[in-house]
Interface confidence: low
């Protein structure tokens, strides 16, 4: 009997010529855990693991500490890949996280952080980023140093207030920092002047929710 | 300029009540937390709880939990402390002071839990019988 | 809940540098702020989130933090800064204000 093959990311399985945009079983490595993922195949050289993704505000991201934990929504819509899954691949090996938006005017930008991984559930996920590049602004709008991760059900953040309840979604929220692109979903047209949106501060302001995001990693180098 | 009126000094019996007011005027009452912090006769200070006027919300101090009532009506721009059930122990100096709402002035949004910047010239109450 | 210690008084002669310490756990992780209080009158924010200062306050005041202590350190003090102080740390494990317990500045004549 054959042996079978696993992939612990987007990128091995592009590796594998598996070159076509979609969803794929990924496993890590001395694990019988199963994930399903969107792989992006053709954004920048291929091999792109969708590790987030808001488009139409189908899925409501307002959940538990253990829902993020473990990952929610469709991956082939919008969907949150899963913070301990994210946390145990980014310390395997060196990986870059970008993140792509778009705006309510046609307008697209990214920012690119050439180093990223996340600590693990007894730190509170917390998020560490080196290396900003892109056109989402000159500022990393995910607070630097990088902060816990919070949920609406374990309150991590710097704030006097709860950020997650405030402002709605999981997110390493500061106090409640520049971002929060688990916010609430709001359309166009209602989506100016709303504190707790899908917020890029440096990129689209401060009162501005966007229209579309995507988190995704690859293996760096 | 900015500053915080307090209501006069005020003497009461043990058992009573207190409601302390705070007027704020230049800036915008619902940008800004309000807080209230005592002084007993030759101690230091001690925090009471605070007010998001924006919102209503309120935040005790474990200490004064059940006791104490913090309200403000937003149409005067006035804070208000009650302190019911009053003791000796309870004379001091009450103060509010103000700190920037890390949410209401989100541009950024980044403030750490902010400092006291304005306080109040502080209203005595004394407790006795 | 968390638990701010400073020392109950401090003495330096005018011109000379003053140090006011705040212990605390791990508080070097934390943001401080520094509290001036002059008799009879309100307290008068001195030093914010561990080092900047207020407009209106002079460059004299400074603070500093790392590990178990923070430091408000006053050079050159004058007679006028002669009152007490105060340290103040935001708890989150409790959404809780903390302030410490007070120092009281003397200036030697």
């Known amino acids: 009997k054959g042996e079978q093959i696993s992939f612990r990311d987007c990128a091995e399985v592009f590796k594998s010529g598996h070159t076509t945009n979609g969803v794929y079983t990924l496993t890590l490595p001395n694990s019988t855990e199963e994930v399903k993922a969107y792989c992006d195949m053709e954004a920048g050289g291929g091999g792109w693991t969708i590790i987030q993704r808001r488009e139409d505000g189908s899925v409501d991201f307002q959940r538990t500490w253990k829902e993020y934990k473990v990952g929610f929504g469709n991956p082939s819509g919008e969907y949150w890949l899963g913070n301990e899954f994210v946390s145990q691949l980014t310390n395997q090996q060196r990986y870059v996280l970008k993140i792509h938006l778009k705006d309510w005017e046609g307008n697209e930008a990214y920012s690119l952080y050439e180093h990223f991984y996340l600590s693990s559930e007894e730190l509170n996920y917390r998020i560490h980023l080196k290396g900003l590049t892109g056109t989402a602004g000159k500022i990393s709008s995910i607070s630097q140093p990088g902060n816990d991760f919070s949920t609406k059900d374990a309150d991590n953040d710097k704030c006097i207030c709860k950020c997650s309840q405030m402002l709605t979604g999981g997110w390493w929220f500061d106090a409640c920092g520049p971002s929060n692109l688990n916010g609430m979903y709001y359309p166009q047209r209602q989506n100016t002047n709303k504190f707790n949106g899908i917020k890029w501060y440096y990129w689209k302001g401060s009162g501005y929710s966007l229209k579309g995001t995507t988190m995704m990693i690859r293996p760096a180098g | 300029q900015v500053q915080l009126v307090q209501s006069g000094a005020e003497v009461k019996k043990p058992g009573a009540s207190v409601k302390v007011s705070c007027k704020a005027s230049?800036?915008?009452?619902?940008?800004?937390?309000m807080h209230w912090v005592r002084q007993a006769p030759g101690q230091g200070l001690e925090w009471m709880g605070w007010i998001n006027p924006n919102s209503g919300g309120t935040n005790y101090a474990q200490k004064f939990q059940g006791r104490v009532t913090m309200t403000r009506d937003t149409s005067i721009s006035t804070a208000y402390m009650e302190l019911s059930r009053l003791r000796s122990d309870d004379t001091a100096v009450y103060y509010c002071?103000?700190?920037?709402?890390?949410?209401?002035?989100?541009?950024?949004?980044?403030?750490?839990?902010?400092?006291?910047?304005?306080w109040g010239q502080g209203t005595m109450v004394t407790v006795s019988s | 809940s968390y638990v701010l210690t400073q020392p109950p008084s401090v003495s330096v002669a005018p011109g000379q540098t003053a140090r006011i310490t705040c212990g605390g756990n791990?508080?070097?992780?934390?943001?401080v702020h520094w509290y001036q209080q002059k008799p009879g009158q309100a307290p008068v924010l001195v030093v914010y989130?561990?080092?900047d200062r207020p407009s209106g306050i002079p460059e004299r005041f400074s603070g500093s933090n790392s590990g178990n202590t923070a430091t408000l350190t006053i050079s050159r003090v004058e007679a006028g800064d002669e009152a007490d102080y105060y340290c103040q740390v935001w708890d989150s494990s409790s959404d809780h204000w903390v302030f410490g317990g007070g120092t009281k500045l003397t200036v030697l004549s």
């Open positions: 791990n508080i070097g992780s934390k943001s």
């Open positions: 002071a103000r700190s920037p709402n890390p949410y209401y002035y989100s541009s950024p949004g980044y403030y750490y839990p902010a400092a006291f910047d304005i």
């Open positions: 230049g800036y915008n009452f619902a940008g800004y937390y």
């Open positions: 989130d561990t080092s």
